[in-house]
C-alpha cells in the first residue's frame, strides 16, 4: 500500500480466483484514542472500533472511503483504491490502447517544435467517474522539471455503438535549449482512477523524436504562362523554432483529386516553393518534416486547383 | 560561445555539402546496423545515450546560432579553447567565433573517427563477420575534416591486447552511431545556418 | 494485372512521320497518366512527353516540341504518339509507361522499334 | 535541364558480392530521384521509387539512398539475375531526365 495523495491510498493486489488478498492496516488521524468507529462509503454499519481498522482487501468492495467517527463526528477518512495485477502484469482496463505507433501504446505525445513544449492524448470509452493526474521529468534517476497542465478533455468521437473520450495534457519543459542534444529522455506519467480503480500509465521519448510540425501557412498559386504548371509557395508555420536555416524544414508537394486512389503530381523540395501540374478539380497539398531528423510529416496544408 | 551573423563568401558553403554526405552515410549506418543486430539492443528505446565528446567538446554551444544565445538555457558554462585556423570560410571572414564552432565540430569528428576506427579492426576479428562500418562513412568524415582543414594533434588509434568481446563491442558500435546521428544532425544545422548566413 | 502491349516495328524514310501505339489492360485508363519514353540502340533513356487521358492535357520535353503529338483514345484504352519530320537520329526503341504518380514509371510496354532510313 | 551523371558507366563485379552505383544531379533535386533496371532486350523496370522507396516484388536487396544531387543505389550481394545496366532519373521539374546508365557486368 502507498500513499498516492493526501488521504488517498493504493492498495496493489494480484488479481486471480481465490486470492489471499492484502491485509491493510488504516489509522484514525486524530488524537483521540477511545470510542472511535469505523465505516464504509455510505453505509452506517459499524466495521470496527478503535484508533486502528485492520482490514483484508481481496475486491473492489473492500475498497472505498474508510471514515472513522466518535459520536456522530467525522474524525478523519481514507480512501482505499485498488491496482490489480494479472499474470504479473497491471491491469491497463481504464485507457484505450492506440496501437500507433505499436501495440500497448496507451499516451501519445507530438510537438510542434524544439521549444520543450509538448502535448500528450489518451483515449477512453469511459464518461463519468474519471480522473487524471500528471507528471513529467526530464530522466528518471536525476530528475529535471518538466511542468503539465491539468488533462482535459479535448475531444468525443462516436466509433460504431461507442462514444469515445480523447483527453490531452500540455507539458513544458522548465529549462530547455531548442538547440540541445538530448540525452535524457522525457518521461511522462499519468495516473487513472476510475472509480476506485487506480492505473498509471507511461511513456518515454525525446522531443527529436515526437516533431510532427504545424502544416505550411499561406499557400499560394501562381499560374505559368502557356503551360500547364502552377509554381506553388508557401511560409514556415508560425510555430517552427527559428532560425528556420537552423531548424530547417524540407516539404512534399502534392496534386490529386478527392480520392486517395486517384491519379498525382508529387514532388519533395527543400525550398518554400514548388512547381506542379494543376488538374481540374484537384487541390494542391503541402506538407512539413524536420530536414535533418525525420520525424512525422505536418498534417497537409491545401488549396483548390481552380 | 556562439554563431555571429557572418557574410561568408557567396555561392556553396563547401562544408554544408559534406556536412549533408556525412549525416546520410551515418543515417545509412545505422539503419544497417539496427537490421544486421536486430537481436541485439540497437534501437534508440534500447540503448544508453552516451556522448563520447561530452566535456571534451561543446560543439552545441561553440555553434549556438545568434538568435537562440538570448535563451538563457542555451548557455552552458563549459569553455573550451579551439584552434582557430579553419578554411571552411574565407579566413579573412572567420570571425573567432566561428572558427571555435568548427574547430569544435573537427575534433568531433577526430574523436568518433578514432573510435571507429579501433572498433573496427575488433569488428574484423570477429569470426561471424556479422557487421563492418561502412567505408563510405568514414570517408565522408575524412572529407569534412579535409574541408575544415584544422591543424591539430593526431589521435594515436587505441589499441588493446585483450581478447574483444564481440557482443559489447556491437552494442558499444549502436551506441556510437546512435550519438554520432544527434551530433551529425547539429553539424547539418549549423553548416545550413553558416550558408544562409 | 497490368499491361502495355505496343505496335509493332515501323521502318519510315526520313522526313516521314510514325505512330506508334500502347493499347492498356488492368485497371482504368484514364486513372493512369502515360509517357513516351525513347531509347537509341546502345543508348540511354530519353523522355518525351506525357498525357492525362482523362482530360487530353500533354506536356512534351523542348526537345521534342513541334515534332511530337501525344493522344489517347480512352473507348479503346489505347495512347498514341505520332512522330513527324523523322531523322536517322530518330531510329530507337520507343517504350509508352503509366503510372498514378506523374513524374516516374512504374510499368513499361514492350517497346517498339523505329528504324529511321533511305 | 537537370543533368544526371552515373558513374561507374561499367562496375565489373563478383556474384555474390555487393555492388553501388553511385547518380549526381546537377543540381538539387531533393530526394526526386528513382532507380530502373533494365536487361537486355527488356523494357525497363522501376526498382526504386523518391531515393529509397521500396517497391513492392523488388527484392529487399536493393536499396536507395540520398538526397541533394548524391544517390547511391545498393545491391547488397548480386544475384546472376541482377546482371544488367541500371538507370537513375530525376523527377524534380520537366523535363524528366536520366543518367546515361551503368552496367553490372560479371567480373
Known amino acids: 500500500i502507498w500513499e498516492l495523495k493526501k488521504d488517498v491510498y493504493v492498495v496493489e493486489l494480484d488479481w486471480y480466483p481465490d486470492a489471499p488478498g492484502e491485509m491493510v492496516v488504516l489509522t484514525c488521524d486524530t488524537p483521540e484514542e477511545d470510542g472511535i468507529t469505523w465505516t464504509l462509503d455510505q453505509s452506517s454499519e459499524v466495521l470496527g472500533s478503535g484508533k486502528t481498522l485492520t482490514i483484508q482487501v481481496k475486491e473492489f468492495g473492500d475498497a472505498g472511503q474508510y471514515t472513522c467517527h466518535k459520536g456522530g463526528e467525522v474524525l478523519s477518512h481514507s480512501l482505499l483504491l485498488l491496482h490489480k495485477k494479472e499474470d504479473g502484469i497491471w491491469s491497463t482496463d481504464i485507457l484505450k490502447d492506440q496501437k500507433e505507433p505499436k501495440n500497448k501504446t496507451f499516451l501519445r505525445c507530438e510537438a510542434k517544435n524544439y521549444s520543450g513544449r509538448f502535448t500528450c492524448w489518451w483515449l477512453t470509452t469511459i464518461s463519468t467517474d474519471l480522473t487524471f493526474s500528471v507528471k513529467s521529468s526530464r530522466g528518471s534517476s536525476d530528475p529535471q522539471g518538466v511542468t503539465c497542465g491539468a488533462a482535459t478533455l479535448s475531444a468525443e468521437r462516436v466509433r460504431g455503438d461507442n462514444k469515445e473520450y480523447e483527453y490531452s495534457v500540455e507539458c513544458q519543459e522548465d529549462s530547455a535549449c531548442p538547440a540541445a542534444e538530448e540525452s535524457l529522455p522525457i518521461e511522462v506519467m499519468v495516473d487513472a482512477v476510475h472509480k476506485l480503480k487506480y492505473e498509471n500509465y507511461t511513456s518515454s521519448f525525446f522531443i527529436r523524436d515526437i516533431i510532427k510540425p504545424d502544416p505550411p501557412k499561406n499557400l499560394q498559386l501562381k499560374p505559368l504562362k502557356n503551360s500547364r504548371q502552377v509554381e506553388v509557395s508557401w511560409e514556415y508555420p508560425d510555430t517552427w523554432s527559428t532560425p528556420h536555416s537552423y531548424f530547417s524544414l524540407t516539404f512534399c508537394v502534392q496534386v490529386q483529386g478527392k480520392s486517395k486512389r486517384e491519379k498525382k503530381d508529387r514532388v519533395f523540395t527543400d525550398k518554400t516553393s514548388a512547381t506542379v501540374i494543376c488538374r481540374k478539380n484537384a487541390s494542391i497539398s503541402v506538407r512539413a518534416q524536420d530536414r535533418y531528423y525525420s520525424s512525422s510529416w505536418s498534417e497537409w496544408a491545401s488549396v483548390p486547383c481552380s | 560561445r556562439n554563431l555571429p551573423v557572418a557574410t561568408p563568401d557567396p555561392g556553396m558553403f563547401p562544408c554544408l555539402h559534406h556536412s549533408q554526405n556525412l549525416l546520410r552515410a551515418v543515417s545509412n549506418m545505422l539503419q544497417k546496423a539496427r537490421q544486421t543486430l536486430e537481436f541485439y539492443p540497437c534501437t534508440s528505446e534500447e540503448i544508453d545515450h552516451e556522448d563520447i565528446t561530452k566535456d571534451k567538446t561543446s560543439t552545441v554551444e561553440a555553434c549556438l546560432p545568434l538568435e537562440l544565445t538570448k535563451n538563457e538555457s542555451c548557455l552552458n558554462s563549459r569553455e573550451t579553447s579551439f584552434i582557430t585556423n579553419g578554411s571552411c570560410l574565407a579566413s579573412r571572414k572567420t570571425s573567432f567565433m566561428m572558427a571555435l564552432c568548427l574547430s569544435s565540430i573537427y575534433e568531433d569528428l577526430k574523436m568518433y573517427q578514432v573510435e571507429f576506427k579501433t572498433m573496427n579492426a575488433k569488428l574484423l576479428m570477429d569470426p561471424k563477420r556479422q557487421i563492418f562500418l561502412d567505408q563510405n562513412m568514414l570517408a565522408v568524415i575524412d572529407e569534412l575534416m579535409q574541408a575544415l582543414n584544422f591543424n591539430s594533434e593526431t589521435v594515436p588509434q587505441k589499441s588493446s591486447l585483450e581478447e574483444p568481446d564481440f557482443y559489447k563491442t556491437k552494442i558499444k558500435l549502436c551506441i556510437l552511431l546512435h550519438a554520432f546521428r544527434i551530433r551529425a544532425v547539429t553539424i547539418d544545422r549549423v553548416m545550413s545556418y553558416l550558408n544562409a548566413s | 494485372q497490368v499491361q502495355l502491349v505496343q505496335s509493332g516495328a515501323e521502318v519510315k524514310k526520313p522526313g516521314s512521320s510514325v505512330k506508334v501505339s500502347c493499347k492498356a489492360s488492368g485497371g482504368t485508363f484514364s486513372d493512369y497518366y502515360l509517357h513516351w519514353v525513347r531509347q537509341a540502340p546502345g543508348q540511354g533513356l530519353e523522355w518525351m512527353g506525357w498525357i492525362d487521358p482523362e482530360n487530353g492535357d500533354t506536356e512534351y520535353a523542348p526537345k521534342f516540341q513541334g515534332r511530337v503529338t501525344i493522344t489517347a483514345d480512352e473507348s479503346t484504352s489505347t495512347a498514341y504518339m505520332e512522330l513527324s519530320s523523322l531523322r536517322s537520329e530518330d531510329t530507337a526503341v520507343y517504350y509508352c509507361?503509366?503510372?498514378?504518380?506523374?513524374?516516374?514509371?512504374?510499368?513499361l510496354g514492350q517497346g517498339t522499334l523505329v528504324t529511321v532510313s533511305s | 535541364d537537370i543533368v544526371m551523371t552515373q558513374s561507374p558507366l561499367s562496375l565489373p563485379v563478383t556474384p555474390g558480392e555487393p555492388a553501388s552505383i553511385s547518380c549526381r544531379a546537377s543540381?538539387?533535386?531533393?530526394?526526386?530521384l528513382h532507380w530502373y533496371q533494365q536487361k537486355p532486350g527488356q523494357q525497363p523496370r522501376l526498382l526504386i521509387a523518391?531515393?529509397?522507396q521500396s517497391i513492392s516484388g523488388v527484392p529487399s536487396r536493393f536499396s536507395g539512398s540520398g538526397s541533394g544531387t548524391d544517390f547511391t543505389l545498393t545491391i547488397s550481394s548480386l544475384q546472376p539475375e541482377d546482371f544488367a545496366t541500371y538507370y537513375c532519373q530525376q523527377s524534380n521539374s520537366f523535363p524528366l531526365t536520366f543518367g546515361q546508365g551503368t552496367k553490372v557486368e560479371i567480373k
Open positions: 509507361a503509366r503510372n498514378k504518380e506523374l513524374r516516374y514509371f512504374d510499368v
Open positions: 543540381q538539387s533535386i531533393s530526394i526526386n
Open positions: 523518391f531515393a529509397s
